[in-house]
């Protein structure tokens, strides 16, 4: 299904690569979804070229993209969810290049929010909660998040935890005493919908209590 | 306290087929992402597979794709792994483990897979 234009005033056209990639979001305003495409190589002159997507839709044949600066976005209630899109590349009315997608399959979460960490003395650990606005959903409902957290001092060691709920705790016996940590989380699509990793919730900072020496126990902070 | 049993392996011929079961306890299964690690004789941990709590998503070393399937049953509790065309490689110690990075602490006591004619 998918070509290079052959008309000669497109010459220069045929030259660019004009693979891109997108993704959906279910339900992202109300009932609301939204189709994001980008091309893969920024360096792409894109001042004439347009995204289309035709098929799988409900009362039209086809919908044309916004352009936002480099990207190239949708937001409709006329996905079917059913079967696949056809989205190409324009330039006028001729095709560069189309891919057959599935907008099931493209799905990207809405970043996790409200991420917190309590320290719960009497039981020696520390409850993690987040929030994700995927509980109120009518599709995407199903998420697998990524726990991410490290000792600030560590750059790059980050101990990740794959969980479907909102809610893990950290033994403190686990961490460091006296640490300073980050923490995040970001969610993928678990079930029947697939996609990608949505963006990393805003980091939270939290500190290890010190070790109380008469006990071996840390100090409350 | 986290309780993790492997079973199912043995001794079996090259080409052959094996599925290692892992029943767990102390926390909620459905919850957590589930990997198979195993560690060959002399050698470190490798990691074998990944599965997501629902299911959803699975992912494979380059060395097992196409040969094993990483499945699980939330219901029971139990996570498997069917591994088909087994080679004399695959020779292992094979561990289920919590998808937390911290292997070491998270695994059961593992079941012996022996691969030879």
């Known amino acids: 299904e998918s070509g290079y234009a052959q008309n000669g005033d497109l010459e220069d056209a045929e030259l660019d690569d004009y693979s891109f990639s997108c993704y959906s979001q279910l339900e992202v305003n109300g009932s609301q979804h939204s189709l994001t495409c980008a091309f893969e190589d920024p360096d792409v002159n894109i001042t004439n070229l347009e995204f289309e997507i035709c098929g799988a839709l409900v009362e039209v044949k086809c919908l044309n993209f916004r352009k936002l600066q480099e990207i190239y976005f949708i937001e409709t209630k006329k996905f079917l969810l059913i079967g696949k899109s056809n989205i190409c590349v324009k330039v006028g009315e001729k095709s560069l290049t189309c891919k057959k997608i599935d907008l099931t399959t493209i799905v990207k979460p809405e970043a996790p929010f409200d991420l917190s960490v309590v320290y719960r003395e009497g039981a020696n650990d520390f409850v993690v909660t987040f929030n994700t606005s995927h509980l109120q959903k009518k599709y995407v409902k199903v998420l697998m998040h990524d726990v991410a957290y490290r000792q600030e001092k560590d750059e790059n060691k980050w101990t990740h935890v794959n969980l479907s709920s909102t809610k893990l705790t950290l033994l403190q016996r686990k961490l460091q005493p006296a640490a300073m940590y980050e923490i995040k989380v970001r969610s993928i699509p678990d079930h029947y919908f697939k996609g990608f990793w949505s963006e990393w919730s805003p980091s939270y900072y939290f500190r290890t209590p010190e070790i109380n020496n008469s006990s071996g126990e840390m100090d409350p902070i | 306290q986290v309780q993790l049993v492997e079973s199912g392996g043995g001794l079996v011929q090259p080409g052959g087929s094996l599925r290692l079961s892992c029943t767990t306890s102390g926390f909620t299964f459905t919850t957590y992402a589930m990997k198979w690690v195993r560690q060959a004789p002399g050698k470190g941990l490798e990691w074998v597979a990944f599965i997501s709590p629902a299911g959803g998503i699975t992912d494979y070393a380059d060395s097992v794709k196409g040969r094993f399937t990483i499945s699980r049953d939330n219901a029971k509790e139990t996570l498997y792994l069917r591994m088909d065309s087994l080679k004399p490689e695959d020779t292992a110690v094979y561990y289920c483990?919590?998808?937390?990075?911290?292997?070491?602490?998270?695994r059961g006591q593992g079941t012996q897979v022996t691969v030879s004619s």
């Open positions: 483990a919590r998808g937390d990075s911290d292997t070491n602490n998270n």
